[in-house]
Interface confidence: medium
């Protein structure tokens, strides 16, 4: 099939999760091809590698694309010490990364 760029979304932790003391920031990458993709996390502009879990789906039976999530797991306290959260996805369909961000103080 033809190459397909991912649709990228980033989500802050839910209010319920923050109440429980945890904070998972999720980057959601949908319907891309081929499977090879690189995801980078930045917190306040600095790259973060620990606490990241990446998970792929099986190849979709309808259109042969892949999807994945990248989850950055933090404590509530650490999450609230920072403001800017960024997910950068690098895929062969683009020469520059696809960047999605949010600022905690705007959620």
């Amino acid at each position: 099939r033809a190459d397909a760029a991912p649709t990228v979304s980033i989500f802050p932790p839910s209010s319920e999760q923050l109440t429980s003391g945890g904070a998972s920031v999720v980057c959601f990458l949908n319907n891309f091809y081929p499977k090879d993709i690189n995801v980078k996390w930045k917190i306040d502009g600095s790259e973060r590698q620990n606490g990241v879990l990446n998970s792929w789906t099986d190849q979709d039976s309808k259109d042969s694309t892949y999807s994945m999530s990248s989850t950055l797991t933090l404590t509530k306290d650490e999450y609230e010490r920072h403001n800017s959260y960024t997910c950068e996805a690098t895929h062969k369909t683009s020469t520059s990364p696809i960047v999605k961000s949010f600022n905690r103080n705007e959620c």
Partner: nanobody, 129 residues
């Protein structure tokens, strides 16, 4: 067992509105985040929107932001998707999902679209003039 029954789909003109409902039973609804996903003809599953267990947080894919609104009524075990300003590209079968079904569990961040979660049979939305 888990049962999810979607309703509210139909044929609507571009720019029109529909409200989808998903009635849930067989599990403690208020403990679960809920999602809507869709599948256009010949395409893969696309996650659309999700709402956390208590309704305190909502999430949308960029293509529907500002047009779709997800909500839930835990007393009625029902999740809703209000769809406004519909476009032809919104044409798809819409499914609601729970657990680690074809979306992700917001509070834990798990992602397992062909895993142990559940989804309904879907409701068809056709946007055409």
């Amino acid at each position: 067992q888990v049962q999810l029954v979607e309703s509210g789909g139909g044929l609507v003109q571009p720019g029109g509105s529909l409200r989808l409902s998903c009635a849930a039973s067989g599990f403690t609804f208020s403990n679960y985040d809920m999602s809507w996903v869709r599948q256009a003809p010949g395409k893969g599953l696309e996650w659309v929107s999700a709402i956390s267990s208590g309704g305190g947080s909502t999430y949308y894919v960029d293509s529907v932001k500002g047009r779709f609104t997800i909500s839930r009524d835990n007393a009625k075990n029902t999740v809703y998707l209000q769809m406004n300003s519909l476009k032809p590209e919104d044409t798809a079968v819409y499914y609601c999902a729970t657990g680690s079904g074809p979306a992700f569990r917001l509070s834990g961040g798990s992602w397992s679209p062909r895993g142990d979660g559940s989804r309904g049979q879907g409701t068809l939305v056709t946007v055409s003039s």
